[in-house]
Amino acid sequence: MRTEAQVPALQPPEPGLEGAMGHRTLVLPWVLLTLCVTAGTPEVWVQVRMEATELSSFTIRCGFLGSGSISLVTVSWGGPNGAGGTTLAVLHPERGIRQWAPARQARWETQSSISLILEGSGASSPCANTTFCCKFASFPEGSWEACGSLPPSSDPGLSAPPTPAPILRADLAGILGVSGVLLFGCVYLLHLLRRHKHRPAPRLQPSRTSPQAPRARAWAPSQASQAALHVPYATINTSCRPATLDTAHPHGGPSWWASLPTHAAHRPQGPAAWASTPIPARGSFVSVENGLYAQAGERPPHTGPGLTLFPDPRGPRAMEGPLGVR
């Protein structure tokens, strides 16, 4: 996702310092500062819909909100892929699609979103409380996964009780990759500024540029190291009804399409009903940032109950190995 922050104006260092440190030494901190401020946290959203006409038929939609390029999407059910989940489809942005029953049709909708239609008949058909997960492998962010499920009720006339649904996960691969370099740079930058200015480094305050804008946060060194060690797992409660949308979406916007960032906001060619179905007003959203707030001792301002944090047991090499069906 793209983050925006209003950065306080920083005064250039005293001329004496410039002579002591050298011009080239000064360039690095400002480059790093720019990277620290602009580096955003990608997010994954998942929508699970039960067809009103065919109650045992599901449509899953997933999207990636990040600036990196997607290298692979894996859709699984019964839990996260590699953690007891069974792969339903693997989608490569250039090389195509592999899918398995009960997947009827997997397809790319936009450059950053996919859809999967599941068949409703047969022994392998999904049950109402099945968890569906979408995992996006991207460069340079790494691997990000979100999950959502439908409640036990299959009666289109009844609204089901809330069920624990979407999960969002970032594998350590991304955080320990490019992000690790940035974090190290940020720590180094703060160290330099403290050392040479003889005063605390300017603290970047989170700010909301608009009601819809995501919250940006500048990490202090302690938070940065924690963020690299603890992969956030955020869980929220949602309720689900047939023929409505369930979302694990980072924005509680007025409509699904309107809330996508610019690079993914063009509508895919799909049923008009999707484009016009509003997200419920309660439309909670899940963000990896939740974990950072929790680690900093603050309650995330936008999560529902039951926030849990724990690292991916598979570690930083989780996405290695052949793409596809292993």
């Epitope: 090389r95 195509g96 699609i97 793409l323």
Partner: antibody
Amino acid sequence: EVQLQQSGPELVKPGSSVKISCKASGYTFTDYNIDWVKQSHGKSLEWIGAIDPNNGGTNYNQKFKDKATLTVDKSSSTAYMELRSLTSEDSAVYYCTRWDSNDWYFDVWATGTTVTVSS
Amino acid sequence: DIVMTQSQKFMSTSVGDRVSITCKASQNVRIAVDWYQQKPGQSPKALIFSSSNRHTGVPDRFTGSGSGSDFTLTIRNVQSEDLADYFCLQHWISPYTFGGGTKLEIR
């Protein structure tokens, strides 16, 4: 050497069923999907479906969904395709092929099994 | 289903010549197209994957190109052993579909 060895030719009667085998060797069977392809006499190729030997997950071409059933036996590294309710239209050469999930293509093909449906 | 059209059913060429076999997809399939060679009485063999990548052991006389909906297999310095049927395949979306094939004849 990576190899896929298929069972021999079959001459069957209309309405009956036939089960073709495809034995894999030279690699870890569960690491690659097995797909099946039909080639009618003098015609092009048609993709029937795929199976993941890891968990038995399948994907069928809708055209063959009521015709073919794909299974695997991990213990013998063998994939099977059963064809049912056979008609003369099913007379063809059937190939099993290995799907390379690194590079996304069919990198190894078996020699094929000829099925002839005749009364 | 995506239709893969190989408009030339037969192509005739001479040893040493250069020949281009084309394949057109009914919709955008990015680079999810492979080429397979089937010699008489044999099973198909992989030539090119993902539009332009040569399968292991395939001579560099064979090159693939294209993306979107138009794809080409080019054989330069044609040899007598290249007499075969050539099929394109799309795996962009299920069901995967093959082209009708192009039979290369050597004069």
